[in-house]
Interface confidence: low
Amino acid sequence: LCQGSNYSTCASCPSCPDRWMKYGNHCYYFSVEEKDWNSSLEFCLARDSHLLVITDNQEMSLLQVFLSEAFCWIGLRNNSGWRWEDGSPLNFSRISSNSFVQTCGAINKNGLQASSCEVPLHWVCKKCPFADQALF
């Protein structure tokens, strides 16, 4: 169904697991705890999801409604240019950066911000909904 690629579209998929929120055609998990970027990524991958990869401005605007000014880790890194974890380039939004050592991306209700990857922040995971909620 929807369980193939982490980055597949989820147009007609059913509900989200407990503690995840359904917006549009995906499920999103807003963390309660704070972790560094790598630990946040591991958390998402362990749950058959990925750190938030935003596909367009519409999705970004949708998610920003649920954020405050504090930042959350997303699946965005600067490896010779800002790229999402699915390999696609960041091309629909600008990212603010204060230093070349800030190589991981975070989001708040105002936009994208580069940060040092070691900083503990909340994070957002994204996945396709599953038919079987009992998976989680």
């Epitope: 407990d18 503690r19 807003f30 309660v32 954020l67 405050s68 504090a70 909340h122």
Partner: antibody, heavy 121, light 107 residues
Framework: QVQLQQPGAEMVRPGASVKLSCKTS????????MHWVKQRPGQGLEWIGK????????HYNQKFKDKATLTVDKSSSTAYIQLNSLTSEDSAVYYC??????????????WGQGTLVTVSA | DIQMTQSPSSLSASLGERISLTCRAS??????LNWFQQKPDGTIKLLIY???SLDSGVPKRFSGSRSGSDYSLTISSLESEDFADYYC?????????FGAGTKLELK
């Protein structure tokens, strides 16, 4: 460092209103929700509501919807709670507390010292 | 509203003792629970957030855990400054609700 400053005490008459202040410093006022919490003498804590200083969006505990009004003054980085039609039940310490992080997930790392409101004729 | 049932309401304990306080949530709060300490002068301090994360500057003798709908605060070895009131708070849904509190006294 982060500071939330509240006056120590207010004495008010039954039926009157009072506006309590919470003056903040040490952080960007508009970046964090401000919460208000009530504690009656010898009792536990009750959440009144919260306000986002950036746009004055509020969430109230229904129990306090007609009792409390939350406002902010961005120019002075001060949050306010106005309590109206005061009775003896409103005699309590009122705390402001700074929220943090996600709009849907709030907790309070910083608290004011509280203002004791005494309603007495 | 989510009810938070806190126990015990009071507790007498000795210096160096290990103690645990519990809050039971009336419905799932998904780990969205804090513990606060209130000193006799009214000062309130965040100890634990997100069930088990220690806030900055809080001594390691404090810890938080969860078993189903029961959330616990444990102090591994009581020190004199730990005698105070303790409250849990759920922030999973509005209105945010506190437990009724536990008064921790020196035996």
């Amino acid at each position: 460092q982060v500071q939330l400053q509240q006056p120590g005490a207010e004495m008010v008459r039954p039926g009157a209103s009072v506006k309590l202040s919470c003056k903040t410093s040490g952080y960007t006022f508009t970046s964090y929700w401000m919460h208000w919490v009530k504690q009656r003498p010898g009792q536990g804590l009750e959440w009144i509501g919260k306000i986002d200083p950036s746009d004055s969006e509020t969430h109230y505990n229904q129990k306090f919807k007609d009792k409390a009004t939350l406002t902010v003054d961005k120019s002075s980085s001060t949050a306010y709670i106005q309590l109206n039609s005061l009775t003896s039940e409103d005699s309590a310490v009122y705390y402001c507390a700074r929220g943090r992080l996600l709009r849907l997930r709030d907790w309070f790392p910083y608290w004011g010292q509280g203002t004791l409101v005494t309603v007495s004729a | 509203d989510i009810q938070m049932t806190q126990s015990p309401s009071s507790l007498s304990a000795s210096l160096g003792e290990r103690i645990s306080l519990t809050c039971r949530a009336s419905q799932d709060i998904y780990g969205s629970l804090n513990w606060f300490q209130q000193k006799p002068d009214g000062t309130i301090k965040l100890l634990i957030y997100g069930t088990s994360s220690l806030d900055s500057g809080v001594p390691k003798r404090f810890s938080g855990s969860r078993s189903g709908s029961d959330y616990s605060l444990t102090i591994s070895s009581l020190e004199s400054e730990d005698f105070a009131d303790y409250y849990c708070l759920q922030y999973a849904s509005f209105p945010l609700t506190f437990g009724a509190g536990t008064k921790l006294e020196l035996k």
